[in-house]
């Protein structure tokens, strides 16, 4: 990817899926009701036209979000810490990297509207997700729809990343 | 393509045991729940419980509970539902479907192509 | 448990006709309400989700209404092919729970 996102990246998303999951606290079958639409912004990785500069904006964007959404008074109350601990240490990693990176890609020349439109957009999206929390008087179960809905647009943003990563091998095979 | 895949239909006798099972394919198995429901011959639908393939955690239907388990293997993407001791009254066709979660997604859009269970001495 | 209870439990019309099978939950379910289609021999299909989301793939002819206890499908043009039995399901809260059943039959 650009910086040649190194496969450890793609590793680190991995163990960001796996520690949400461990970090339930409740059994989600009790939260049906508290279902909420949160619209997140698929057409966002779902596109087949994948420059570097917007999946890295993407996946930056989304890594910040999580981040400042678990580095909360708020979230320290909800959740084991230890876990909250190890989710803070690997976000801060692959955020770091990601910096890096997209230096690189603008400086590659990349425009910057792939970057900042992206970023605008799911900015809106954890907007949405703090009200509802705060509506919601940050309930165990509001967390856990948000935990899961975290979960699934985590998991949407790490396969355009790998789709990104199988389009540059196929580039660079042939 | 998504696809929910059922075993075979099943004659059995009261008293026995049997586990049907439902492999998904085409999509992360872990990410979806997957639900039960039962129709009995001429009738409605009547939902039977669910399962969370990620962690195994089930819900049921208080008219099942105890009647029926329903359990999952992540490693091949199946979910599984079995009863200890059939009675002729079981005899019915089974579907499993697969449920978004606490997700905002479409509830019960994939369905197996359903599992007829007899049970008659 | 959530009650859902159909209307009516069949009825016989003709294609090209607008056909109405309304549905109301035990207690208010805001919009957590599906629509299935069920043919013979066959599993059931969802046609709408959210009481008013047209499932992808499903003709436009088909429309879901309502919030709360009270739902509505509505076929706007009957065609061959929707002559089957409807069940509405809610999705609110465990247990989940299916209406009875509306089958529309050939006049």
């Known amino acids: 990817l650009g910086c040649d996102l190194p496969q450890n990246h793609g590793l680190l998303s991995r163990n960001t899926l796996v520690l949400l999951h461990q970090m339930r606290r409740i059994s989600p079958f009790l939260c049906l009701k508290d279902r909420r639409d949160f619209r997140f912004p698929q057409e966002m990785v779902k596109g087949s036209q994948l420059q570097k500069a917007h999946v890295m904006s993407v996946l930056h964007e989304m890594l910040q979000q999580i981040f400042s959404l678990f580095h909360t008074e708020r979230s320290s109350a909800a959740w084991n810490m230890t876990l909250l601990d190890q989710l803070h240490t690997g976000l801060h990693q692959q955020l770091q990297h990601l910096e890096t990176c997209l230096l690189q890609v603008v400086g590659e020349g990349e425009s910057a509207g792939a970057i900042s439109s992206p970023a605008l957009t799911l900015r809106r999206y954890f907007q949405g997700i703090r009200v509802y929390l705060k509506e919601k008087k940050y309930s165990d179960c509001a967390w856990e729809v948000v935990r899961m809905e975290i979960m699934k647009s985590l998991f949407l943003s790490t396969n355009m990343q790998e789709r990104l990563r199988s389009k540059d091998r196929d580039l660079g095979s042939s | 393509e998504v696809q929910l895949v059922q075993s075979g239909a099943e004659v059995k006798k009261p008293g026995e045991s049997l586990k049907i099972s439902c492999k998904g394919s085409g999509y992360s198995f872990t990410s979806y729940w997957i639900g039960w429901v039962r129709q009995m011959p001429g009738k409605g639908l009547e939902w039977m419980g669910i399962i969370d393939p990620s962690d195994s955690d089930t819900a049921y239907s208080p008219s099942f509970q105890g009647q029926v388990t329903i359990s999952a293997d992540k490693s091949i993407s199946t979910a599984y539902l079995q009863w200890s001791s059939l009675k002729a009254s079981d005899t019915a066709m089974y579907y499993c479907?697969?449920?978004?979660?606490?997700?905002?997604?479409?509830?019960?859009?994939?369905w197996g192509q359903g599992t007829l269970v007899t049970v008659s001495s | 448990d959530i009650q859902m209870t159909q209307s009516p439990s069949s009825l016989s019309a003709s294609v090209g006709d607008r056909v109405t099978i309304t549905c109301r939950a035990s207690q208010s379910i805001g919009s957590a309400l599906n629509w299935y289609q069920q043919k013979p021999g066959k599993a059931p299909k969802l046609l709408i989700y959210f009481a008013s989301s047209l499932q992808s793939g499903v003709p436009s002819r088909f429309s879901g209404s309502g919030s709360g206890t009270d739902f509505t499908l509505t076929i706007s043009s009957l065609q061959p092919e929707d002559f089957a039995t409807y069940y509405c399901?809610?999705?609110?809260?465990?247990?989940?729970?299916f209406g009875q059943g509306t089958k529309v039959e050939i006049k």
């Open positions: 479907a697969r449920h978004p979660g606490l997700n905002w997604a479409p509830d019960f859009d994939y």
């Open positions: 399901q809610q999705s609110y809260d465990f247990p989940l729970t």
